[in-house]
Interface confidence: low
């Protein structure tokens, strides 16, 4: 008996057809995904296939004006429109608390979604009842196939999911449902969910009577043959694990953003047994035309969009400086107004011991596009905060050596003077450079803001200890020469939109006046 | 092609710990597979030991769970085999083989530990 | 631990004979089964793997059959180079154990 499975992750809100890093599509002859095109190539499998279900492994939400408008209504709106057959709940979708997915999402949605290891308490308990599920037993032709979801642990800390969802192990979770559905005789069972390509290698391994597993969270590319496009892949699609019983068992992902759609095809025994499995993902170019219904449909939810760029979000009553003369040789204050913002859109009290989990930010000064003038009335919209943050990237999380931050504020003046992008903006950052020295000794000075405290004050970076920073996505990737992050990071979850971030501050705030206060000195 | 060699002492005195190592060429173990070891005692009884997966983990036998340990070395493209307290029953050819989510198609040409005073 | 019992524990045979070798799982493996040859001095070779596909390069005359627990290894008109020991495994779940091994030897 064949499956096909069609699967999605990390979409994040790219509802409409984007270039091919993903981002606002500029020339529509050379872009990519989009739910309009997706429709068209789920909708050619499913009628030249028997058995086809359509995954989304979660982190549907955020990532475009699209979410930030529409608040995730238009998440249920077009995967109701694709009939999606499942999917797992990702670290994003509680970006706006419980409440921002129950009623737009939970309520709204026509399929299952899916989370085995997030259990509800006190009273959501209740409300939140049989809104998602930990697993649901799908009927495909002949046979019925389970589906188990899961959402990463770290939840709590990436984005806002309240005092009253706790976050189990993955593996401890999946277990029992997973033995349930053995119980129920369903022996063809399929582990979708957003914990990233370690833990779906490890629930793979690990958890007995898993099938397959389709993942999500670290956008991983995986490939078998001559890739399509620019994303170098992480591995063979599928990836092959061998579990602990050993059988070998599938794990896939699709990359991100909707630029592919996963395609698995598993051959079972009469036993529920994979014996074969191939596939890849399909590059969703502009060799597959967009749907005209869907697309049609996007076009009306769009004019909402158009309007909400330009109002206001809130006002400044200082110049906010954005030039490339400050940002890229100076402490300039929308440097620390970004950063600023982004440490504000990671307040988590973690417990008593801890202010917040994450204290810092780095900024690369190229990365801030343009200034926003006081004098228009001090209106700042969301058109403005897209010519400083023009690049559609995200505000991510990272873990780093003190020796590795200590690398990366050498970096940042190593060439400094020649107005090069990667002179770092700071939050919870004390930084002195002396310039007389040669390059790769210029940081005299470089105080950290402690979490682990209760009245946070200033100290020395420790050059072995362990730190949470906040910094733009191109920086953890290694963009602007800072390879050293990339290479030394020791874990990277990905964050919210950036414009939205500055955006939501803003808004929250609702009159600004970041000043230069001293965390760049030059001594 | 790939070629699995197991080198170490072929003389350990009971109570000591027998240490092996299986270099690994043509293929680089950390890029997949999982790699064993496999014991045959004289008389050709074969028992499977364990193994060190592509990206570090480890299973072994449950009747060599207190005394086993494999660990490797990716600079040197070589996994380890230590066995703590052996004893004469322990006497048997060691062999390192790639196996995984398949059976084992690569195997080292084997070497005899012989445990005695 | 799934025992593999393997029968018969030697067997006599003459160049150009068909043999069965037979391997019984104390539990329920499936396909997940392999056999091997194993010659005097030598490490095991891969001859089949679940349970009836023919390794690379081995000839056609050797075939696997079974599922479950009952597995059966053939060799068509037995060539000189086919005498040795055989050994089945079962790699459904860990521990991975063998059969006792079939000695076949030259009548």
């Known amino acids: 008996w064949e499956l096909t499975i069609l699967h999605t992750n990390d979409v994040h809100s790219r509802l409409e057809q984007t270039s091919e890093d993903s981002s606002k599509c500029v020339n529509a002859s050379r872009c990519m995904g989009g739910v309009a095109r997706l429709f068209t190539k789920v909708q050619q499998i499913r009628r030249a296939e028997p058995n086809v279900l359509l995954l989304d492994a979660g982190d549907q939400y955020q990532g475009t004006i699209w979410f930030t408008v529409y608040k995730g209504a238009e998440v249920a709106h077009f995967m109701n429109a694709l009939r999606y057959d499942a999917m797992a709940l990702g670290n994003h979708e509680f970006d706006n608390g419980v409440e921002g997915l129950i009623e737009p999402l939970l309520k709204e949605a026509k399929f299952p979604i899916l989370s085995a290891n997030i259990k509800a308490k006190g009273p959501l308990a209740s409300q939140i009842s049989g809104l998602y599920l930990p697993y649901k037993v799908l009927p495909v032709g002949d046979e019925v196939v389970g589906i188990v979801g899961y959402t990463s642990k770290e939840t709590p800390f990436l984005s806002n999911p309240g005092t009253n969802l706790v976050f189990e192990d993955e593996i401890t979770a999946l277990q029992p449902e997973v033995d349930k559905l053995k119980t129920l005789n369903v022996n063809k069972i399929i582990a979708l969910g957003h914990s990233g390509f370690e833990t779906d290698k490890l629930i793979a391994q690990k958890v007995r009577g898993v099938d397959v597993v389709v993942g999500g969270h670290s956008n991983t590319f995986l490939y078998t043959g001559n890739p399509p496009s620019k994303e170098v892949p992480a591995g063979k699609y599928p990836f092959i694990v061998t579990s602990d019983d050993g059988r070998k068992v599938p794990v896939v992902q699709a990359y991100a953003f909707g630029k592919y759609l996963g395609y698995l095809k598993i051959e079972f025994d009469e036993r529920g047994n994979v014996i074969s499995s191939h596939g890849n993902p399909i590059l969703l170019n502009s060799s597959i035309p967009e749907d005209p219904s869907i697309k049609a449909d996007i076009n009306k939810w769009r004019i909402k969009l158009d309007n909400y760029s330009t109002q206001e979000l809130g006002k400044t009553i200082v110049y906010l400086d954005g030039s490339s003369q400050s940002c890229r040789f100076r402490e300039c204050n929308m440097g620390n107004l970004i950063c600023d913002a982004m440490i504000n859109n990671n307040l988590r009290h973690a417990d008593e011991m801890f202010w917040n989990h994450v204290s810092m930010c780095i900024l690369n000064g190229g990365g801030i596009r343009s200034p926003i003038d006081e004098r228009n009335n001090g209106t700042i919209t969301w058109e403005n905060l897209a010519a400083v943050l023009p690049f559609g990237g995200t505000f991510d999380l990272v873990q780093l050596k003190g020796s590795t931050l200590k690398k990366a504020f050498e970096h940042s003046v190593h060439r400094y003077g020649q107005s090069t992008g990667e002179f770092l903006q700071v939050g919870g950052i004390h930084v002195v450079y002396d310039l007389s020295r040669k390059p790769g000794d210029r940081v005299v000075k470089l105080d950290v803001l402690c979490t682990k405290c209760r009245v946070p004050s200033y100290d020395p970076l420790k050059m072995d200890e362990i730190y949470k920073v906040i910094l733009p996505n191109f920086l953890a990737n290694g963009g602007d020469g800072f390879q050293m992050i990339k290479d030394e990071l020791l874990r990277h979850d990905s964050g919210d939109q950036d414009i939205n971030v500055v955006s939501t501050y803003i808004s929250k705030m609702k009159v600004i006046y970041p000043a230069v206060e001293g965390r760049i000195k030059f001594s | 092609d790939i070629q699995l060699q197991e080198s170490g002492p072929g003389l350990v005195k009971p109570s000591q710990s027998l240490s092996l190592t299986c270099s690994v060429t043509g293929y680089s173990i950390t890029s997949r597979y999982y790699w064993n070891w496999i014991r045959q005692f004289p008389g050709n009884k074969l028992e499977w030991m364990g193994y060190i997966t592509y990206d570090d983990n480890n299973n072994y036998n449950p009747s060599l769970k207190n005394r086993i340990s494999i660990t490797r070395d990716t600079s040197k493209n070589q996994f380890f085999l230590k066995l703590n307290s052996v004893t004469p029953e322990d006497t048997a050819t060691y062999y390192c083989?790639?196996?995984?989510?398949?059976?084992?198609?690569?195997w080292g040409q084997g070497t005899l530990v012989t445990v005695s005073a | 631990d799934i025992q593999m019992t393997q029968s018969p524990a030697s067997l006599s045979a003459s160049v150009g004979e068909t043999v069965t070798i037979t391997c019984r799982a104390s539990d329920n493996i499936y396909s997940y089964l392999a056999w091997y040859q194993q010659k005097q001095g030598k490490s095991l070779q891969l001859l089949v793997d679940s349970a009836k596909n023919l390794g690379e390069g081995v000839p056609s005359r050797f075939s696997g059959s079974g599922s479950g627990t009952q597995f059966y290894l053939k060799i068509n008109s037995l060539q000189p180079e086919d005498f040795g020991v055989y050994y089945c495994?079962?790699?459904?779940?860990?521990?991975?154990?063998f059969g006792g091994g079939t000695k076949l030897e030259l009548k």
């Open positions: 495994q079962h790699y459904y779940g860990t521990p991975f154990t």
């Open positions: 083989a790639r196996g995984g989510w398949d059976p084992f198609l690569y």
